[in-house]
C-alpha cells in the first residue's frame, strides 16, 4: 500500500513539476526591468526565452519574437536546449510512469516489469528536473553578470545635462516557477525510484524438498531466487531541491486596433 502511495505521489508531484517546467519555458517573464532607479516608469520591459515584451502604462503590451537563431547569445540557446530536453525527458517519463503505476492493470504485466518502468521514469524525472534547474540557474547567472556590468556603466553619454539610462534586468517570475518546478520534478523522480524498490519482488526462499529415490537419497535444494530489474535495485538518489515561488506580474489587457506579432 505504501509503495502504491509513494509511486502515485511521485507521479503526481512529477506531473505538477513538468507542467511547471513547460509553463516556465513558455513564460515571457524570465527577466524583468529593474525598477530600482525608476519605480514609476511608464514603459516596462520584460523578456522570455522566445520573445521580448514592452508593457506601457497605457495598458498596451507589445511583444516581439526573436526571429533569429544565429544572432542569439549562446547562453540563451543553451538555456532553451536544457529546458526543451527537460520537457521531452519529463514527458517520456510521464508516459512510462503511467504504465508503471501499480493501480493500473495492463494485461499480465509482471511486477518486475513495472519496477523496471518505475525506475526508468524516476531517473527520467530526476534528469528532467536537473535540466530545468540547470537551465534556470544558467539564465539567472547570466542576468546577475549583466546586471552588475550595466550597473558599472549605469549612465552612458553624460554630455551636458543629457543622460542615457541603461535598462537593467532582474529575475523574472519564470525563474522562480522554473526552480520550483524543477525541484518538484526531481522530488517526484526520487519518490519513483524509492517506489521501485518496493515494487521489485522480494527474495523468495523455498523450503528444501526431499525426494526419496530407491537405493540412494538425493536432497534437492534450489538456491534463493532474486528478480532482476535490469537496473541496480538498490539505487538510492536523494538529491532534493527546494525552490521559492513568486507570482507573475499582472498584465493588463488592452483593446488594440493593431495586431502585433
Amino acid at each position: 500500500m505504501a509503495v502504491t502511495a509513494c509511486q502515485g505521489l511521485g507521479f503526481v508531484v512529477s506531473l505538477i513539476g513538468i507542467a511547471g517546467i513547460i509553463a516556465a519555458t513558455c513564460m515571457d517573464q524570465w527577466s524583468t526591468q529593474d525598477l530600482y532607479n525608476n519605480p514609476v516608469t511608464a514603459v516596462f520591459n520584460y523578456q522570455g526565452l522566445w520573445r521580448s515584451c514592452v508593457r506601457e502604462s497605457s495598458g498596451f503590451t507589445e511583444c516581439r519574437g526573436y526571429f533569429t537563431l544565429l544572432g542569439l547569445p549562446a547562453m540563451l540557446q543553451a538555456v532553451r536546449a536544457l529546458m526543451i530536453v527537460g520537457i521531452v525527458l519529463g514527458a517520456i517519463g510521464l508516459l512510462v510512469s503511467i504504465f508503471a503505476l501499480k493501480c493500473i492493470r495492463i494485461g499480465s504485466m509482471e511486477d518486475s516489469a513495472k519496477a523496471n518502468m518505475t525506475l526508468t521514469s524516476g531517473i527520467m524525472f530526476i534528469v528532467s528536473g536537473l535540466c530545468a534547474i540547470a537551465g534556470v540557474s544558467v539564465f539567472a547567472n547570466m542576468l546577475v553578470t549583466n546586471f552588475w556590468m550595466s550597473t558599472a556603466n549605469m549612465y552612458t553619454g553624460m554630455g551636458g545635462m543629457v543622460q542615457t539610462v541603461q535598462t537593467r534586468y532582474t529575475f523574472g517570475a519564470a525563474l522562480f516557477v522554473g526552480w520550483v518546478a524543477g525541484g518538484l520534478t526531481l522530488i517526484g523522480g526520487v519518490m519513483m525510484c524509492i517506489a521501485c524498490r518496493g515494487l521489485a519482488p522480494e527474495e523468495t526462499n523455498y523450503k528444501a524438498v526431499s525426494y526419496h529415490a530407491s537405493g540412494h537419497s538425493v536432497a534437492y535444494k534450489p538456491g534463493g531466487f532474486k528478480a532482476s530489474t535490469g537496473f541496480g535495485s538498490n539505487t538510492k538518489n536523494k538529491k532534493i531541491y527546494d525552490g521559492g515561488a513568486r507570482t507573475e506580474d499582472e498584465v493588463q489587457s488592452y483593446p488594440s486596433k493593431h495586431d502585433y506579432v
Epitope: 526591468q33 525608476n38 514609476v40 516608469t41 511608464a42 514603459v43 520591459n45 520584460y46 523578456q47 521580448s52 515584451c53 514592452v54 506601457e56 502604462s57 497605457s58 495598458g59 498596451f60 507589445e62 516581439r64 543629457v162 543622460q163 542615457t164 539610462v165 541603461q166 535598462t167 499582472e250 493588463q252 489587457s253 488592452y254 483593446p255 493593431h258
Partner: antibody, heavy 118, light 113 residues
Framework: DVQLVESGGGLVQPGGSRKLSCAAS????????LHWIRQTPEKGLEWVAY????????YYADTVKGRFTISRDNPKNTLFLQMTSLRSEDTAMYFC???????????WGQGTLVTVST | DIVMTQSPSFLTVTAGEKVTMSCRSS????????????LTWYQQKPGQPPKLLIY???TRESGVPDRFTGSGSGTDFTLTINSVQAEDLALYYC?????????FGAGTKLELK
C-alpha cells in the same frame, strides 16, 4: 464617438476643496487608463494624476501629492479628481484625457476651469 | 523629472512653406526593449483641448494629414509640417511619454506672417 465631459469647476477659496468629474462615453471605459492634466497661460500643460484601468497603480505629480485624489467608477463611466487644500497656483483649466498607444493622450475633454482666489 | 525644451517659442510662416520645430529632452526617450522613442506631439488651437498628432516620435495618429511628420531619436526630436495650411496655425507641444511624471514642453506657436 469617444466623448469626455468635465464638470465641477468654479471659484474656490484658498485652502478649500473641490471635486471634479469626467463623464466618459463612446468607448470601453474600464479598458483604459485615464489622466487629469491642467493648463495655465504661465505654466502651459502640466500632468496632474493618472489612474490605470483597474484603479491600480495611481500616480500623482509631486505638486499635488497628498492634496489631490484621483478615482474612477467603472460601472458609471466616470473619473473623479478630489482636490483639497487648494492654493492659488492650482488655478487652471483641468482636462481629463484617455491614455493611448505610446503613452499618449488621444482624447481630451473640453476642460473645466478651477479658480482659487479670495 | 525629464525636462522638455521646445524651440523656437514662436514661428512665423507663410502658407505653403515647410516648417520645422524642435524638441529636446533632458534624458533619452528611447526604450531599449522595443527600440521606440516615447515622445508625443500635440496641436492645440485657441479655446480647444490639445489634439494628438504623433506618438512613438514618428507614428501619425489616424486622421492626421500626412504633411505632419515626426522624426528624431534619443533626446532630439523634430516635427515637420510640409506645406503649411491656414488651419495649421496653432500651438504645438511635445510630451515625454517615457516616465512619470509625464512632462510637456512649453510649446511652439505657429503664426502667420
Amino acid at each position: 464617438d469617444v466623448q469626455l465631459v468635465e464638470s465641477g469647476g468654479g471659484l474656490v477659496q484658498p485652502g478649500g476643496s473641490r471635486k471634479l468629474s469626467c463623464a466618459a462615453s463612446g468607448f470601453s471605459f474600464s479598458g483604459f487608463g485615464l489622466h487629469w492634466i491642467r493648463q495655465t497661460p504661465e505654466k502651459g500643460l502640466e500632468w496632474v494624476a493618472y489612474i490605470s484601468s483597474g484603479s491600480r497603480p495611481i500616480y500623482y505629480a509631486d505638486t499635488v501629492k497628498g492634496r489631490f485624489t484621483i478615482s474612477r467608477d467603472n460601472p458609471k463611466n466616470t473619473l473623479f479628481l478630489q482636490m483639497t487644500s487648494l492654493r492659488s497656483e492650482d488655478t487652471a483649466m483641468y482636462f481629463c484625457a484617455r491614455f493611448y498607444f505610446g503613452n499618449s493622450f488621444d482624447h481630451w475633454g473640453q476642460g473645466t476651469l478651477v479658480t482659487v482666489s479670495t | 523629472d525629464i525636462v522638455m525644451t521646445q524651440s523656437p517659442s514662436f514661428l512665423t510662416v507663410t502658407a505653403g512653406e515647410k516648417v520645422t520645430m524642435s524638441c529636446r529632452s533632458s534624458q533619452s526617450l528611447l526604450n531599449s526593449g522595443n527600440q521606440r522613442n516615447y515622445l508625443t506631439w500635440y496641436q492645440q488651437k485657441p479655446g480647444q483641448p490639445p489634439k494628438l498628432l504623433i506618438y512613438w516620435a514618428s507614428t501619425r495618429e489616424s486622421g492626421v494629414p500626412d504633411r505632419f511628420t515626426g522624426s528624431g531619436s534619443g533626446t532630439d526630436f523634430t516635427l515637420t509640417i510640409n506645406s503649411v495650411q491656414a488651419e495649421d496655425l496653432a500651438l504645438y507641444y511635445c510630451q515625454n511619454a517615457y516616465s512619470f511624471p509625464l512632462t510637456f514642453g512649453a510649446g511652439t506657436k505657429l503664426e502667420l506672417k
